[in-house]
C-alpha cells in the first residue's frame, strides 16, 4: 500500500513510510484540539488488494470553549449551536440596553485548549443627558438630570414680546433613544412670518388671513383664460419664505398651434371678477401690501 489516508482531525502515530506491506497496521490519534470518543477504530490495515481498510476521523471531537452565560439584560446566541472551536457566540441586549464590548466572540484553538477571542460584553442601561435648552422656549422635566430609554420631553415656546408669536420649528416631543442620544434635534422658537402672497389674475381659494405664520398654507386658482405656473398650494416655511414659491397666473395662448396648459386648480371659473380690494384676505387700499409685512 502507498501512504495511508490523511484526515482533518486525526494524525498518524509515528513517521509515515512511502510503502507498507500487506497486513501492516497503522495507528492514528486525534490531532491537537480534538479528543477521541469510542467506539470508532483509529487504525487501518493494508489490505490484500493494496488499499487501506476503511477508517474515519469521526471519533475525534473538537475541544470546546467554556460556557458563557447570557449577559445581564441581554442574550448570548450560539451561531451554530455548539461550543466547539470554530463556534461564534453573538450577543444582543434587551430593549433599553446597549452593548459595551464586542458583539461577536469566536471560539479559537490555542494549542490544545479552546478559548474565546475576548471577554464577554456587558449590557448597560441606555441613559441620556438632559436635552438642550432652547432660546425663547422650554421643555418639560427641566429639573431631571438623567433620562432613561424612551423617556420623552415636550418643548413649548414662550409668549412673544411683540405682536407676532414664536413658532416652534422642529419636533415638539423628543425621546431618549438607542445610542443614548435624543431622537431628534431640539426644536427652535422664533417668529416666522411670510409675505402676503399676491397672485395677479388669480385668487386664493383657501388659507385666508391677514398674517401668515409658520406652516400657514394657502391655495390658489387662476382666472378664466389664465393657467397656473407653479404649485396651487404653498406653505410658509421656517425661513419666512413660501415653499414652493408663490405661483403665477399666465395668459392662455390663443394660437391654434399651441395647446394651452391646464390649470392645476380645478373647478368652475368666475365669470365676473370683482376688484382686488374686495377679495377676502387682501389688504384694504389704505393698508398697502408692504405696510402689512413687518408690523
Amino acid at each position: 500500500c502507498e501512504a495511508p489516508p490523511t484526515f482533518e482531525a486525526m494524525e498518524l502515530i509515528g513517521k509515515p513510510k512511502p510503502y507498507y506491506r500487506v497486513g501492516e497496521r497503522v495507528d492514528y490519534k486525534c490531532k491537537k484540539g480534538y479528543f477521541y470518543i469510542p467506539p470508532l477504530a483509529t487504525h487501518t490495515i493494508c489490505d490484500r488488494n493494496h488499499t487501506w481498510l476503511p477508517v474515519s476521523d469521526e471519533g475525534c471531537y473538537r475541544e470546546m470553549c467554556p460556557h458563557i452565560r447570557d449577559p445581564l439584560n441581554g442574550e448570548a446566541i450560539l451561531a451554530n449551536g455548539s461550543y466547539e472551536f470554530g463556534a461564534e457566540l453573538h450577543f444582543i441586549c434587551n430593549e433599553g440596553y446597549y452593548l459595551i464590548g464586542k458583539d461577536i466572540l469566536y471560539c479559537e484553538l490555542k494549542d490544545t485548549v479552546a478559548i474565546w477571542s475576548g471577554k464577554p460584553p456587558l449590557c448597560e442601561k441606555i441613559l441620556c443627558t438632559p436635552p438642550p435648552k432652547i432660546k425663547n422656549g422650554k421643555h418639560t422635566f427641566s429639573e431631571v438630570e438623567v433620562f432613561e430609554y424612551l423617556d420623552a420631553v415636550t418643548y413649548s415656546c414662550d409668549p412673544a414680546p411683540g405682536p407676532d408669536p414664536f413658532s416652534l420649528i422642529g419636533e415638539s416631543m423628543i425621546y431618549c433613544g438607542n445610542n443614548s442620544t435624543w431622537s431628534h434635534a431640539a426644536p427652535e422658537c422664533k417668529v416666522v412670518k411670510c409675505r402676503f402672497p399676491v397672485v395677479e389674475n388669480g385668487k386664493q381659494i383657501s388659507g385666508f388671513g391677514k398674517k401668515f405664520y409658520y406652516k400657514a398654507t394657502v391655495m390658489f386658482e387662476c382666472d378664466k383664460g389664465y393657467y397656473l405656473n407653479g404649485s396651487d398650494k404653498i406653505v410658509c416655511e421656517s425661513n419666512s419664505t413660501w415653499d414652493p414659491p408663490v405661483p403665477k397666473c399666465l395668459k392662455v395662448s390663443t394660437s391654434p398651434t399651441t395647446k394651452s396648459p391646464t390649470s392645476s386648480a380645478s373647478g368652475p371659473r368666475p365669470t365676473y371678477k370683482p376688484p382686488v380690494s374686495n377679495y377676502p384676505g387682501y389688504p384694504k387700499p389704505d393698508e398697502g401690501i408692504l405696510n402689512n409685512l413687518d408690523d
Partner: antibody, heavy 120, light 109 residues
Framework: QVQLVESGGGVVQPGRSLRLSCAAS????????MHWVRQAPGKGLEWLSF????????YYADSVKGRFTISRDNSKNTLYLQMNSLRAEDTAVYWC?????????????WGQGTLVTVSS | SSELTQDPAVSVALGQTVRITCQGD??????VSWFQQKPGQAPVFVMY???NRPSGISERFSGSSSGNTASLIITGAQAEDEADYYC????????????FGGGTKLTVL
Amino acid sequence: QVQLVESGGGVVQPGRSLRLSCAASGFTFSTYGMHWVRQAPGKGLEWLSFISYDGDEKYYADSVKGRFTISRDNSKNTLYLQMNSLRAEDTAVYWCAKASGYGMGILDYWGQGTLVTVSS
Amino acid sequence: SSELTQDPAVSVALGQTVRITCQGDSLRSYYVSWFQQKPGQAPVFVMYGQNNRPSGISERFSGSSSGNTASLIITGAQAEDEADYYCHSRDSSGTHLRVFGGGTKLTVL
C-alpha cells in the same frame, strides 16, 4: 494496554506536604493530557486538576487551587501531584486518569488509586 | 463552581429498564461522560453523550439528553450493573474546569 500506577500515598499530618506520582505505560504519554481525581471515604468523585500533553496548560478545582500543583515529566512517562498544606478533608483515594486527547478530552483510563490519610 | 445533580439512589428489578439522570446548567451546552464504579474499584468510563460506548461496555447502556438533563439508560438491567454511577461534564461558570455529579447508587432487585 494502557496502564496507570499511582504511588506516594500514606498517612501525613495536617499542614504537611506529600507528592503523588503516576507512572504511565502502554500509550504515548507525551501526547496526552492527564487528570487527577479523588474520592473521600463514603463520598463521591471530585475532579482536582488537569495538565496538557506538554505541561503548558494547567487547571485546578477551587478546593485545591494554591495548595496543589500538577506537573509531568514526559521523559519519565510520569505525572505528579504536589500537595501542600494538607487538611483533614484532603483524606481520600487519589486517582490519575488519562485524557483522550492532547487536551482535556474525556477521562478514558484510570489507575488503581492511592490512599492519602491526613491525620494528627 | 457549578454542580451536576444526581438522585442519590435508584433501584430497578432484574431485566427491567432504568434511567439515571444528571441535571446541570452546563448540560445545555456540553455532553456528559458517565462512569461506573463498583466498591473498592476505580471508576470505569461507560458512555459519552448519546451513544458513544467504549469497546467492552454492554449495548444495554445508552444515553440521552434534553435541555439541562442527561440520562444514562440501562435496558434489561443485570446483577453486575449494580454500582455507583457518576456523570461528569464541564463547569458552567465560564472556566475550563470539570465537575462530577454526586453519584447515583443503582440497586438491582
